[in-house]
Interface confidence: low
């Protein structure tokens, strides 16, 4: 593909990514919408593994906090929005049942549009 | 989170999401850049769990395959691009060593811009 320096690529929405430990997270929302506790460690064959997640969200300090970059403002209002995905995690529910559940985590920052009325 | 379509919102890039099993995936790229085999099942205290992932990518059949929606075309070229993140998976490397590794999976479809030259 062509040379990216000549392409001078920019993101429509600025995001930040970080590793988040279960200790930082503490709780999460599972696929049924319930709040579960994220366990700090996962038992594996040779002991325990620290449970952590790679999360990406919209950058609150970024240029795009007021709206998306590069949008046709005559026709559209825009907003950068953090989107979520599901990852499996060892969790405990409100009834103290421990199990592997899919939980929601922040994975991206995307641009959403609404059409401008009354033009 | 609430459905953006209900709010009369449109995404700048159309995406599709699906559950992908380890059997479908077969291999993945780990954090060191190596190709690893994704194991179909994970041993848990009460037997085995099928290993699968929630993946999101740009919709190749969508309206936005030619460029992002809502962009100011006088000033910008645009492209919808699948982005990746890391999730932990039980994998086997080329030396047949089994272990939990972070692998890359598709998690979003975002819009990237390049400025139009020669205006």
């Amino acid at each position: 593909h062509s040379d990216p320096a000549r392409r001078g690529e920019l993101s429509v929405c600025d995001s930040i990514s970080e590793w988040v430990t279960a200790a930082d997270k503490k709780t999460a929302v599972d696929m049924s919408g319930g709040t579960v506790t994220v366990l700090e460690k996962v038992p594996v064959s040779k002991g325990q593994l620290k449970q952590y997640f790679y999360e990406t969200k919209c950058n609150p300090m970024g240029y795009t906090k007021e709206g998306c970059r590069g949008i046709d403002k005559r026709h559209w209002n825009s907003q950068c929005r953090t989107t979520q995905s599901y990852v499996r995690a060892l969790t405990m529910d409100s009834k103290k049942r421990i199990g592997w559940r899919f939980i929601r985590i922040d994975t991206s920052c995307v641009c959403t549009l609404t059409i401008k009325r009354g033009r | 989170h609430s459905d953006p379509a209900r709010r009369g919102e449109l995404s700048v890039c159309d995406s599709i999401s699906e559950w992908v099993t380890a059997a479908d995936k077969k291999t993945a790229v780990d954090m060191s850049g190596g190709t690893v085999t994704v194991l179909e099942k994970v041993p848990v205290s009460k037997g085995q769990l099928k290993q699968y992932f929630y993946e999101t990518k740009c919709n190749p059949m969508g309206y936005t395959k030619e460029g992002c929606r809502g962009i100011d075309k006088r000033h910008w070229n645009s492209q919808c691009r699948t982005t990746q993140s890391y999730v932990r998976a039980l994998t086997m490397d080329s030396k047949k060593r089994i272990g939990w590794r972070f692998i890359r999976i598709d998690t979003s479809c975002v819009c990237t811009l390049t400025i139009k030259r020669g205006r």
Epitope: I16, Y54 | Y86
Partner: antibody, heavy 121, light 108 residues
């Protein structure tokens, strides 16, 4: 040994442009945040720009270069770039590329040897 | 922007002596602080990250301490190869990543 090798420096007139390249070897370049850092003659280190690994095009700039410099990367070529436009005398410095981590919350653990940019008429 | 301030600007020390370099952040940076060594004509080299973790291959005479806003790099017994410029850098809140102004450790 993990290496970064910068090129593209030189003498340029004020208002001119220059493109720096940084070739990476021996590590999985596409996994890491990368940054450019500069050092003016006899001065300290100044971070210039940074870029994400994941294809989202996320780029970050120091206020002093915003709108004039563009950081980009080509993972297929293991190469980082810095396109510098509208150069000023105060941009004169040694420019280093540096590898960070999988996120930007990491120090710069590998540095290139630097390439010198001189902006003068 | 987080401002990093290093002191002293120059430190004159005899070989074998202890050197203590300070770095102060204008607001908390947690433990997201790194120390770099730079010799004339060379690129910086990472010594310490996470405020106190030594990089593999760095001699144990180098140690880092502190958290929040106050940090210290200590060189317990200066060797001839340790005379150089030292920079602290925060990577807690960016952009921008910010460096201190540097401390030059010179032979007394």
């Amino acid at each position: 040994e993990v290496q970064l090798l910068e090129s593209g420096g030189g003498l340029v007139q004020p208002g001119g442009s220059l493109r720096l390249s940084c070739a990476a070897s021996v590590f999985t370049f596409s996994n890491y945040y990368m940054s450019w850092v500069r050092q003016a003659p006899g001065k300290g280190l100044e971070w210039v720009a940074g870029i994400n690994w994941n294809g989202a095009g996320d780029t970050y700039y120091a206020d002093s270069v915003k709108g004039r410099f563009t950081i980009s990367r080509d993972n297929s070529k293991n190469t980082l770039y810095l396109q510098m436009n509208s150069l000023r005398a105060e941009d004169t410095a040694v420019y280093y590329c540096a590898k960070q981590g999988v996120t930007h919350y990491n120090p710069m653990d590998v540095w290139g040897q630097g390439t010198t940019v001189t902006v003068s008429s | 922007e987080i401002v990093m301030t290093q002191s002293p600007a120059t430190l004159s020390v005899s070989p074998g002596d202890r050197a203590t370099l300070s770095c102060r952040a204008s607001q908390t940076v947690g433990s997201k602080l790194a120390w770099y060594q730079q010799k004339p004509g060379q690129a910086p080299r990472l010594l310490i990250y996470g405020a106190r973790t030594r990089v593999a291959g760095i001699p144990d005479r180098f140690s880092g301490s502190g958290s929040g806003t106050e940090f210290t790099l200590t060189i317990s017994s200066l060797q001839s190869e340790d005379f150089a410029e030292y920079y602290c850098q925060q990577y807690y809140d960016w952009p921008p990543l910010t460096f201190g102004g540097g401390t030059k450790v010179e032979i007394k």
